[in-house]
Interface confidence: medium
């Protein structure tokens, strides 16, 4: 898990296209200490995928997760 590392977990790149929404169960933001701001989507099988928080589909997924 990224939480168990001694250093700050950061994303160095973003997934280029939307993941299937049905596969995503939760999300979190990476630390403000990271050079690239990022949203990490967590899938049903606990795979963690970096996404660009400025992308429309990412914001829509976040809103959907907040409402569910």
């Amino acid at each position: 898990s990224p939480y168990s590392s001694d250093t700050t977990p950061c994303c160095f790149a973003y997934i280029a296209r939307p993941l299937p929404r049905a596969h995503i169960k939760e999300y979190f933001y990476t630390s403000g200490k990271c050079s690239n701001p990022a949203v990490v989507f967590v899938t049903r099988k606990n795979r963690q995928v970096c996404a660009n928080p400025e992308k429309k589909w990412v914001r829509e997924y976040i809103n959907s997760l907040e409402m569910s």
Epitope: S1, I15, R47
Partner: antibody
């Protein structure tokens, strides 16, 4: 320049074991997920196994699950594939490949193989 | 696991455009990548994320993806383009996340 160099292939009897290695250079090894892909003679590409940059997450094709183990030593910039209970159908060229765009820990941001080694041949025969 | 279907072979005359298809259930919702493999050599990534080209890959190579079919197009085909081509996806929540198509042999007439 990114380089991946596989070694450890050879001829082994059915039921035997081999350990493949892939020495990586030219990039920050721990920041990238790595994978093994194989190709049987005259056949197509078959994904075998993958491991996240930290080594905390591993993935296997059904055809090798329980027999093969992927691991990595980030201090040595080396990827491994331990192959046990080998079968004739495991005969193939084994390639190691880097997963483009992935990052440290167990985060994913890419899913394609941007650099490949030249492969090492594994022959399982009695 | 996810299944990708490619035609075993495609033939094209030099200077023409070759189109290689990759079929899959709602593949338009997947990220599709394409590899070129010449005999005795390792595969080379030629298209990633449906349409992007790695540095060093000619503009003659392009990709598209919608519905149930992704397509690799090679315009102004040259003899050096003769090779096997494979599509690949990452089915993120599958137990078998990385999937390759069966490959297509491109023959330049």
């Amino acid at each position: 320049e990114v380089q991946l160099l596989e070694s450890g292939g050879g001829l082994v009897q059915p039921g035997g074991s081999l350990r493949l290695s892939c020495a990586a250079s030219g990039f920050t090894f721990s920041s990238y997920a790595m994978s093994w892909v194989r190709q049987a003679p005259g056949k197509g590409l078959e994904w075998v196994s993958a491991i996240s940059g930290s080594g905390g997450s591993t993935y296997y094709a059904d055809s090798v699950k329980g027999r093969f183990t992927i691991s990595r030593d980030n201090s040595k910039n080396t990827l491994y594939l331990q192959m046990n209970s080998l079968r004739a159908e495991d005969t193939a060229v084994y390639y190691c490949a880097r997963v483009r765009g992935s990052s440290q820990y167990d985060f994913w941001s890419g899913s394609e193989f941007d650099y490949w080694g030249q492969g090492t041949m594994v022959t399982v025969s009695s | 696991s996810y299944v990708l279907t490619q035609p075993p072979s495609v033939s094209v005359a030099p200077g023409k455009t070759a189109s290689i298809s990759c079929g899959g259930d709602n593949i338009g919702g997947q990220n599709v990548h394409w590899y070129q493999q010449k005999p005795g050599q390792a595969p080379v990534l030629v298209i990633y994320y449906d349409t992007d080209r790695p540095s060093g890959i000619p503009e003659r190579f392009s990709g598209s993806n919608s519905g149930n079919t992704a397509t690799l197009s090679i315009s102004r085909v040259e003899a050096a383009d003769e090779a096997d081509y494979y599509c690949q996806v990452w089915d993120v929540d599958s137990d078998h996340p990385w999937v390759f198509g069966g490959g297509t042999k491109l023959t330049v007439l």
